[in-house]
């Protein structure tokens, strides 16, 4: 004869474990039903009655089958430098990630606890390593023959234009200015090219350098201060 299917609560056979989506209640000494995700145990089982489950209260959740007396509280609303990539529901916690132009300076199990603005490389410096979701931009001085005239977290050092006749020589923060109307563009040695789009500029007009100041990138971290990386803007 096939073994009879036991209905919860039931006493397990000695040495055996409870089935999937059941748990062993030490007090009742019975196998009892777990509550589904989005619920919690309102009343624990006894020898004669099974677990009574109830929906999670507002702003709380359970992600797994469980027998917890209270659902877990969702994390705080996402801050202004974050975007909510997963909403708080009865079955899942809220997940906040950093918005574009920011990176995660202090992560948590899921999402980000603290976002910080990506470092901006000032004129004379270009992006050596672009920022990622979890790492800041690394700036480097523009090598001879290259320049960057922007304060940017994405712009790299670009080669100076090659002039037939140079009116003003280029430097690390300014392109060369030609007297000729038909300059040629050259790949100067040491020019860094990162896999990202570079905005096109007119080759015939002298670029107006942008202000060398950038918004403050200071933020609070639970650690001591560290000096800003060379070529980055700071306080």
């Amino acid at each position: 004869l096939p073994a009879q299917v036991a209905f919860t609560p039931y006493a397990p056979e000695p040495g055996s474990t409870c089935r999937l989506r059941e748990y062993y209640d030490q007090t009742a000494q019975m196998c009892c039903s777990k509550c589904s995700p989005g619920q919690h145990a309102k009343v624990f089982c006894t020898k004669t009655s099974d677990t009574v489950c109830d929906s999670c209260e507002d702003s709380t959740y359970t992600q797994l089958w469980n027998w917890v007396p209270e659902c877990l509280s969702c994390g705080s609303r996402c801050s202004s430098d974050q975007v909510e990539t997963q909403a708080c529901t009865r079955e899942q916690n809220r997940i906040c990630t950093c918005r574009p132009g920011w990176y995660c300076a202090l992560s948590k199990q899921e999402g980000c606890r603290l976002c910080a603005p990506l470092r901006k490389c000032r004129p004379g410096f270009g992006v050596a390593r672009p920022g990622t979701e979890t790492s800041d931009v690394v700036c480097k001085p523009c090598a001879p023959g290259t320049f960057s005239n922007t304060t940017s977290s994405t712009d790299i050092c670009r080669p100076h234009q090659i002039c037939n006749v140079v009116a003003i020589p280029g430097n690390a923060s300014m392109d060369a200015v030609c007297t000729s109307t038909s300059p040629t563009r050259s790949m100067a040695p040491g020019a860094v090219h990162l896999p990202q789009p570079v905005s096109t500029r007119s080759q015939h007009t002298q670029p107006t350098p942008e202000p060398s100041t950038a918004p403050s990138t200071s933020f609070l971290l639970p650690m001591g201060p560290s000096p800003p990386a060379e070529g980055s803007t700071g306080d």
């Epitope: 929906s55 507002d58 702003s59 969702c74 609303r77 909403a87 708080c88 529901t89």
Partner: antibody
Framework: QVQLVQSGAEVKKPGASVKVSCKAS????????MHWVRQAPGQGLEWIGR????????KHDPKFQDRVTMTSDTSTNTVYMELSSLRSEDTAVYYC?????????????WGQGTLVTVSS | DIQMTQSPSSLSASVGDRVTITCTAS???????LHWYQQKPGKAPKLWIY???NLPSGVPSRFSGSGSGTDFTLTISSLQPEDFATYYC?????????FGQGTKVEIK
């Protein structure tokens, strides 16, 4: 845009019942709660109860235990609050307000209010 | 029930003044569950500060909120004519959810 539009003013006699409606538009009724809050003339705000329109589950202040009934009609995105055995101290403006699940009960949109006057 | 007590019940202030309203809970309230509403005469309340210190869009930055446990404050750094209204604190920590009695900010 999000809107909560309530039914018009009511005048009732003591002992009667009143049913106030609140029609929601501009958002999905899933994963939100609809609350009822009242304000007696010249007084502060008093929470009556709330309903989960998707499930019909309700919760209310025990002081209204036997007198308040909250229901929802998902086909019309309308919630209702019925208060029975009215007495003069129930004279108030009754507001519906919503709070999205996960926003810790912050009521971000309110109806315009419904004045209920209880007078013999 | 958690009782919410606001002080003062009313205050008179001038444009440009710094104003602080306090809200004291009879038992501890998680900061996520403490909100403030602004109400003007004849109008429905508006959510003004959520989760103790966060401003919904459209609320001027001269408003701020702080606190934890049983003591919470709403501060207006420089009172403007449009700020004259009644402010209510609200706890959603434990049912039944309750409001403070309100603080009326009047023109001096």
């Amino acid at each position: 845009q999000v809107q909560l539009v309530q039914s018009g003013a009511e005048v009732k006699k003591p002992g009667a019942s009143v049913k106030v409606s609140c029609k929601a538009s501009g958002f999905n009724n899933k994963d939100i709660y609809m609350h009822w809050v009242r304000q007696a003339p010249g007084q502060g705000l008093e929470w009556i109860g709330r309903i989960d329109p998707a499930t019909g589950n309700t919760k209310h202040d025990p002081k209204f235990q036997d007198r308040v009934t909250m229901t929802s009609d998902t086909s019309t995105n309308t919630v209702y609050m019925e208060l029975s055995s009215l007495r003069s101290e129930d004279t108030a403006v009754y507001y519906c307000a919503r709070s999205p699940y996960g926003d810790f009960g912050a009521m971000d949109y309110w109806g315009q209010g419904t004045l209920v006057t209880v007078s013999s | 029930d958690i009782q919410m007590t606001q002080s003062p019940s009313s205050l008179s202030a001038s444009v440009g003044d710094r104003v602080t309203i306090t809200c004291t809970a009879s038992s501890s309230v998680s900061s996520n569950y403490l909100h403030w509403y602004q109400q003007k005469p004849g109008k429905a309340p508006k959510l003004w500060i959520y989760s103790t210190s966060n401003l919904p869009s459209g609320v001027p930055s001269r408003f701020s909120g702080s606190g934890s446990g049983t003591d919470f404050t709403l501060t207006i750094s420089s009172l403007q004519p449009e700020d004259f209204a009644t402010y209510y604190c609200h706890q959603y920590h434990r049912s039944p959810w309750t409001f403070g009695q309100g603080t009326k900010v009047e023109i001096k």
